[in-house]
Interface confidence: medium
């Protein structure tokens, strides 16, 4: 049984309808909580703005792959 209604619950109720340039993205996190209406990806941009995106869209998947590779590649 969850102990809090709201604390640490973040949901996406709608998705952006614009593709965001991968150069503008800093990180992402997946939203899979059963408290939320749909699975989602929250991208954080380089100016720290968070935007909801649909994980089923190809550009979202590609962006996540790109960010994953960025974090795996050691910076020289």
């Amino acid at each position: 049984q969850p102990d809090a209604i709201n604390a640490a619950v973040t949901c996406c109720y709608n998705f952006t309808n614009r593709k965001i340039s991968v150069q503008r993205l800093a990180s992402y996190r997946r939203i899979t909580s059963s408290k939320c209406p749909k699975e989602a990806v929250i991208f954080k941009t380089i100016v720290a703005k968070e935007i909801c995106a649909d994980p089923k869209q190809k550009w979202v998947q590609d962006s996540m792959d790109h960010l994953d590779k960025q974090t795996q590649t050691p910076k020289t």
């Epitope: 809090a4 209604i5 709201n6 619950v9 973040t10 949901c11 996406c12 309808n17």
Partner: antibody, heavy 128, light 110 residues
Framework: QSLEESGGDLVKPGASLTLTCKAS?????????MCWVRQAPGKGLEWIAC????????TYYASWAKGRFTISKTSSTTVTLQMTSLTAADTATYFC?????????????????????WGPGTLVTVSS | AYDMTQTPASVSEPVGGTVTIKCQAS??????LSWYQQKPGQPPKLLIY???TLASGVPSRFKGSGSGTEYTVTISGVQSDDAATYYC????????????FGGGTEVVVK
């Protein structure tokens, strides 16, 4: 569009009581809660508990209410509050309220709830 | 534990004046704050949610503001119909919470 509480009564200390909240014409979407709030005579509002009106039926309690109060969703339009070991301090009007979630687009939002619909209340008096 | 402290406990203002009610949370509640109006013998009525958004049908003379731990509701051009008790409520967390409501502020309109 209404909520109506029933079951309030005059009971003796130590007794148990079950209150019922019946909804009419209220939309219980997956992202709303049914809650109980009480108010002792001449005092402020005191949140007791909420139950998720969606499929999960998850329950949430004020720290003081855990163990002695039990909220349950008994049907798609009915919620109950079971109260045990009642004392004079439990004397109050008990309100049923819908907690609704608000959000913004397309930015992430925490589940922000406010009680947007209330019943008229039912009076519980605990006295010997 | 997200305790809500409301001030003042009571305020008296003539018709047309301005009433300001403050609500302080013991920890940041990130704008997860609502305000309610309650008249004697009636259930509370939602006025403001998400700290500053007016609920449907609420007159524009009510204004909510604040952030972090400090929040305010202001009634400008107060009317006799505004005489009531006002409560704030945090909805940031229900974990280990004793009460999500503030203690209330009685508004008397002279």
């Amino acid at each position: 569009q209404s909520l109506e509480e029933s079951g309030g009564d005059l009971v003796k200390p130590g007794a148990s009581l079950t209150l019922t909240c019946k909804a009419s014409g209220i939309d219980f979407s997956l992202y709303s809660y049914m809650c109980w709030v009480r108010q002792a005579p001449g005092k402020g509002l005191e949140w007791i508990a909420c139950v998720d009106a969606g499929a999960s039926g998850s329950t949430y309690y004020a720290s003081w209410a855990k163990g002695r109060f039990t909220i349950s969703k008994t049907s798609s339009t009915t919620v109950t509050l079971q109260m045990t070991s009642l004392t004079a301090a439990d004397t109050a009007t008990y309100f049923c309220a819908r907690g609704i979630l608000y959000y913004t687009w397309p930015y992430p939002a925490g589940a922000i709830d406010a009680f947007d619909s209330w019943g008229p209340g039912t009076l519980v008096t605990v006295s010997s | 534990a997200y305790d809500m402290t409301q001030t003042p406990a009571s305020v008296s203002e003539p018709v047309g004046g301005t009433v300001t009610i403050k609500c302080q949370a013991s920890e940041s509640i990130s704008n997860y704050l609502s305000w309610y109006q309650q008249k004697p013998g009636q259930p509370p009525k939602l006025l403001i949610y998400k700290a500053s958004t007016l609920a449907s049908g609420v007159p524009s003379r009510f204004k909510g503001s604040g952030s972090g731990t400090e929040y305010t509701v202001t009634i400008s051009g107060v009317q006799s119909d505004d005489a009531a008790t006002y409560y704030c409520q945090q909805s940031y967390s229900s974990s280990n919470v004793f009460n999500t409501f503030g203690g209330g502020t009685e508004v008397v309109v002279k």
